[in-house]
Interface confidence: low
């Protein structure tokens, strides 16, 4: 039998974003009655509930979410604060009755550097390239004294050759 | 009292536009989804277009998909249908509806008088 | 896509009881649906809604003589103790995902 159908909406399926932001997980559903809507998460290590709820009704916040979700009617979740370990597949199931039910999955990617972090990157670099131009400075320094040093050991080396000639020859 | 008053019918030639209105009050508006149903003369009812409570889902019966868009402006408290191409057949009494549900797609507990569109050279 | 066949007409006497059925096509029997009554020159009243189990919520004001209920892809609706003003088309309605659908309407005339 066919059911009477849910369809499911997600205008966004991947959402990036820095940690301490809040995110919304956007979906929209139709359906003819009042479905129970499940957000799951599936980080690396298996499948965790978040929330639980029917519109219109207290949602049933898991303990690892309390404090951190807020719901909407038309089934979109919002996360408070999130940090890089929130990053996953986010899955909504909308179940209007046994046997119908849609499914759809959000991708969230949470990275640690934020706008504020880009000035210390700059400041990084600036700093790397000035121990770079020291380093290279010290190093031509380096090699031009390196360079005198040999030419006054060969200068030395050539009077000793010079004189010891002039001893054999004295000799002879 | 939840009331739908239709306004915006009339006489059209073929090809032309139209805009209907429907003005809501009773109730709170931009938490329910909105159809438009019409009836041609002597015949049954035809389901026309749906718009969900904030307007992001629509959808459109296959007979007027490409020529009508719905619409909903929630701080006037009205829906609109914006009619192009008209046809002949188009022809009907058009009736604004109200959903039992925010995203519709469901049925409708309250319905408007309507409003004559009549598509004629 | 779903189907809803209803018979063109149908008429009982005043006072009297009427049963109008609306069929649901193969498939799609476990469809709610919802009654629509739309009274000569008025614009559609909303009655009911009707779930296959035959549970049934009505709208505002409809009085408890119109009932509702089930039985396979069959929904029907009971209007006893007929009155004048019941004279009206009657129309079923179902949805499913973006779609709406009405059968073509009962016509009921309520006899003298």
């Known amino acids: 039998l066919q059911s009477q159908g849910v369809s499911l909406y997600i205008p966004q399926s991947a959402i990036n974003a820095t940690v301490q932001q809040d995110i919304l997980l956007s979906v929209d559903y139709i359906c003819h009655g009042v479905p129970t809507i499940e957000w799951k998460y599936t980080p690396n290590w298996g499948v965790q509930r978040i929330v639980e709820w029917k519109p219109g009704t207290p949602a049933n916040v898991s303990q690892s979410h309390r404090d951190r979700v807020c719901t909407f009617d038309n089934g979109s979740i919002q996360l408070f604060n999130v940090s890089v370990k929130d990053s996953g597949y986010y899955i909504v199931t909308v179940t209007e009755h046994p046997g119908s039910s849609q499914s759809g999955t959000i991708l969230l990617r949470v990275s640690e550097i934020r706008y504020e972090d880009l000035h210390f990157v700059a400041v990084f670099f600036a700093l790397l390239a000035a121990v770079a131009v020291v380093l290279i400075s010290l190093m031509w320094v380096c090699n031009q004294c390196a360079y005198k040093f040999q030419r006054k050991r060969r200068y030395k080396l050539k009077e000793s050759t010079t004189e010891e000639i002039e001893m054999k020859e004295v000799e002879c | 009292e939840v009331q739908l008053v239709e306004s915006g019918g009339g006489l059209v030639q073929p090809g032309r536009s139209l805009r209907l209105s429907c003005a809501a009050s009773?109730?709170?508006?931009?938490?329910?989804?909105m159809h438009w149903v019409r009836q041609a003369p002597g015949k049954g009812l035809e389901w026309v277009a749906v718009i969900s409570y904030d307007g992001s889902n629509k959808y459109y019966a296959d007979s007027v998909k490409g020529r009508f868009t719905i619409s909903r402006d929630n701080s006037k408290n009205t829906l609109y249908l914006q009619m192009n191409s008209l046809r002949a057949e188009d022809t009907a009494v058009y009736y604004c509806?109200?959903?039992?549900?925010?995203?519709?797609?469901?049925?409708?507990?309250?319905w408007g008088q309507g409003t004559l569109v009549t598509v004629s050279s | 896509q779903p189907v809803l066949t209803q018979s063109s007409s149908a008429s009982a006497s005043l006072g009297a009881s009427v049963k109008l059925t609306c069929s649901l096509s193969?498939?799609?029997?476990?469809?709610?649906i919802a009654w629509h009554q739309q009274q000569p020159e008025k614009g559609p009243r909303y009655l009911m809604k009707l779930n296959s189990d035959g549970s049934h919520s009505k709208g505002d004001g409809i009085p408890d003589r119109f009932s509702g209920s089930s039985s396979g892809a069959e929904r029907y609706l009971t209007i006893s103790s007929l009155q004048s003003e019941d004279e009206a088309d009657y129309y079923c309605q179902t949805w499913g995902s973006g779609i709406q659908v009405f059968g073509g309407g009962t016509k009921l005339t309520v006899l003298g």
């Open positions: 509806a109200k959903d039992q549900y925010s995203v519709g797609a469901t049925t409708y507990d309250y």
């Open positions: 009773g109730f709170t508006f931009s938490s329910y989804a």
């Open positions: 193969s498939g799609h029997s476990s469809y709610a």
